[in-house]
Amino acid sequence: QKSSIEKCSVDIQQSRNKTTERPGLLNCPIYWQQLREKCLLFSHTVNPWNNSLADCSTKESSLLLIRDKDELIHTQNLIRDKAILFWIGLNFSLSEKNWKWINGSFLNSNDLEIRGDAKENSCISISQTSVYSEYCSTEIRWICQKELTPVRNKVYPDS
């Protein structure tokens, strides 16, 4: 039995997967900030987690996925205000009793040190210094991401 949050996450991810292939993104759009091979958009307004998820989807992006501790730190360095929290694309899966990224993968327990409980209707936010479990209904800001397409140099075999 999936929670409404899980279902929302799955529905949006599936609808994103169904969309036609678009040309790769070479530069970040206006108002988006580049962080390595990603473009990040930090919202100014606040919303519950599911609305934030849906908003990123309308922007042909997703809530932020963080690969590892290093990416977390680099993202946190972009947050200007100490006390501000931002939703990312990670929430608690009641059916699997584990933290689950919106792309379907599970959290590697070493990646993020989460403050707070792992329980139903919990979603993950980040601040300048920490990672928090919050009620998904809490209205805070959020971070959307778009992947940049790497420009590959052609490698020719030795002649």
Partner: antibody, heavy 117, light 110 residues
């Protein structure tokens, strides 16, 4: 180049509902938020509210009880309804693109709405 | 949620610098780095000049700059030109997804 165009009646009777539509051209409505701002003659700007393309709305607390906004992404349009209008609602009404929720980078040319019997 | 306070008028001669202030509270200007400034010529729609306190959209001359200290934001126009004569409005995010504008300042180029 993104362009916004307000349309709707220029004259509304007191106690009736003011209705305006903003048509967005030169870009998709889906990736941004959209706001309504008004300006009485010779006075300052007042933010009325914003709508997200997912349908969520935020309204100015002073107008919240009378305002309704909606969006039609298929037509690249969003709309404003302001109920129970009085002469104090007479103003130029602007629609604007609200990229992140705190500023407006593209504006319509404005639509003068007069409330009078 | 009251309007931000701006001086009703400001003036300067061509080539001079003029600074327009915008005073709010810790709930709006002081609490967020989300102050913007707009220029409005008579009969025209406002035009974004500064956003997020000090960022300039493309196409806006670098004569326009923004800053903030405490609960007061400022717009400075250096090297005043005749076409800078207009009304200027500040705006700030005010928490809970609300926005508030200033009352406007009429800038006269002498």
């Amino acid at each position: 180049q993104v362009q916004l165009q307000e349309s709707g009646p220029g004259l509304v009777k007191p106690s009736e509902t003011l209705s305006l539509t903003c048509t967005v051209s030169g870009g998709s409505i889906s990736s941004y938020y959209w706001s309504w701002i008004r300006q009485p003659a010779g006075k300052g700007l007042e933010w009325i509210g914003r709508i997200y393309t997912i349908g969520t709305t935020n309204y100015n607390p002073s107008l919240k009880s009378r305002v309704t906004m909606s969006v039609d992404t298929s037509k690249n349009q969003f709309s404003l309804k302001l109920s129970s209008v009085t002469a104090a609602d007479t103003a130029v009404y602007y629609c604007a693109r609200d990229p992140l929720g705190s500023f407006f980078d593209y504006w319509g040319q404005g639509s003068l709405v007069t409330v009078s019997s | 949620q009251s309007a931000l306070t701006q001086p009703p008028s400001a003036s300067g001669s061509p080539g001079q610098s003029v600074t327009i202030s915008c005073t709010g509270t810790s709930s709006d200007v002081g609490g967020y780095n989300y102050v913007s400034w707009y220029q409005q010529h008579p009969g025209k729609a406002p035009k974004l000049m500064i956003y997020e306190v000090s960022k300039r959209p493309s196409g806006v001359p670098d004569r326009f700059s923004g800053s903030k200290s405490g609960n007061t934001a400022s717009l400075t126009v250096s090297g005043l030109q005749a076409e800078d004569e207009a009304d200027y409005y500040c705006s700030s995010y005010a928490g809970s997804n609300n926005l508030v504008f200033g009352g406007g300042t009429k800038l006269t180029v002498l």
